[in-house]
């Protein structure tokens, strides 16, 4: 029997290497059964996750999963950091793992590094 708990499918310690000035969509895959829960995004500030208010968000529906999307239009250097989505379901809060955005400011990068170059940076390796 399939569990009817809400589940948020963000991988633990996942990250995205993105560039300032580009558009970016941060997706929170949500599995639910009958009623779609209310989902929000927050940004980590130390141990506190600050709810993101007034941001452009949307839903995308696929076969077995819905995606709650946070839109960056465009990405700003200040968007660097860790984000978490959470769902309000039957008066309980279900929190996802956090996912980290590493923003490269194109003004300070002579050319866009490859994925392997991104991975070779110590601040990526040990974050």
């Amino acid at each position: 029997k399939e569990s009817c708990d809400v589940q948020l499918y963000i991988k633990r310690q996942s990250y995205h290497s993105i560039f300032a000035g580009d558009p970016f969509k941060l997706e929170c895959p949500v599995k639910y059964c009958a009623h779609r829960p209310q989902v929000t995004w927050c940004k980590l500030n130390g141990t506190t996750c600050v709810k993101l208010e007034g941001r452009h968000t949307s839903w995308k529906q696929e076969k077995n999963l819905s995606f709650f999307i946070l839109h960056f239009e465009p990405v700003l250097p200040s968007d660097n950091g860790s984000y978490r989505c959470s769902a309000n379901f039957l008066s309980a809060i279900i929190e996802s793992h956090s996912t980290t955005l590493y923003v490269t400011d194109v003004k300070s990068a002579s050319e866009r590094p490859s994925k392997d170059e991104m991975a070779s940076r110590p601040w990526l390796l040990y974050s």
Epitope: Q7, Y9, I10, K11, R12, Q13, S14, Y15, H16, S17, L44, T47, E95, H97, S98, K115, D116, M118, A119, L125, Y126, S127
Partner: antibody, heavy 119, light 112 residues
Framework: QVQLVQSGAEVKKPGSSVKVSCKAS????????MYWVRQAPGQGLEWIGR????????RYAQKFQGRATITADESTSTAYMELSSLRSEDTAVYYC????????????WGQGTLVTVSS | DIQMTQSPSSLSASVGDRVTITCRSS???????????LNWLQQKPGKAPKRLIY???KLDSGVPSRFSGSGSGTDFTLTISSLQPEDFATYYC?????????FGQGTKLEIK
């Protein structure tokens, strides 16, 4: 059930490279992390690095930075680990493993690939 | 890097014995989500390692209930309540909290 099958044993010359493959079945690798660990003869386990097959981002232990390259091909559910500038100390059994990226609910290892570096 | 130190490095015991292996990390394994990502592996000669326990105390499916894990912060233990012949192997702890992942040096469990 989740299974991993690795490529066969290799004998390599010092200074050359080796590329080991690891094919997963029973799981969508987009939902996992795949990682590589080695074990020199009679020694303990040493973590090399891991990849997120959903986006291709890899992370490495500092010791292997610049010498190891981990990649994944989602279409064939296969991960690869290439190690360059081989030396005799790289002689080891290389294991790939896969685990659930969301809840760590499974962790499965391949059978291992013996890489011998000898002139 | 986080150092993982296991003790003892080898241990002789008999079938039916209760055995405890300890693992100490050089810093706390408590992650920001409130969980400690500490795993225990079993490896038999010539075979690949197999995970027995994850998140300190959760048993992998198919692992006999005589195996248990406990601990928090920096100190963890693997206990086998009543040794069976198939339990003689090498056991490793390893941490999945921080990069790079690191392993203990192993504990070889031998028949007395």
């Amino acid at each position: 059930q989740v299974q991993l099958v690795q490529s066969g044993a290799e004998v390599k010359k010092p200074g050359s490279s080796v590329k080991v493959s690891c094919k997963a079945s029973g799981v969508n690798i987009k939902d996992t992390y795949m990682y590589w660990v080695r074990q020199a003869p009679g020694q303990g386990l040493e973590w090399i690095g891991r990849i997120d097959p959903a986006n291709g981002y890899a992370r490495y232990a500092q010791k292997f930075q610049g010498r190891a390259t981990i990649t994944a091909d989602e279409s064939t559910s296969t991960a690869y680990m290439e190690l360059s500038s081989l030396r005799s100390e790289d002689t080891a059994v290389y294991y790939c493993a896969v685990y659930d990226g969301y809840y760590e609910s499974f962790d499965v290892w391949g059978q291992g690939t013996l890489v011998t570096v000898s002139s | 890097d986080i150092q993982m130190t296991q003790s003892p490095s080898s241990l002789s015991a008999s079938v039916g014995d209760r055995v405890t292996i300890t693992c100490r990390s050089s810093q706390s394994l408590l992650d920001s989500d409130g969980k400690s990502y500490l795993n225990w592996l079993q490896q038999k000669p010539g075979k690949a390692p197999k995970r027995l326990i994850y998140l300190v105390s959760k048993l992998d499916s198919g692992v006999p209930s005589r195996f248990s894990g406990s601990g928090s912060g920096t100190d963890f233990t693997l206990t086998i309540s009543s040794l069976q012949p198939e339990d003689f192997a090498t056991y490793y702890c390893w941490q999945g909290t921080l990069f790079p992942r690191t392993f203990g040096q192993g504990t070889k469990l031998e028949i007395k």
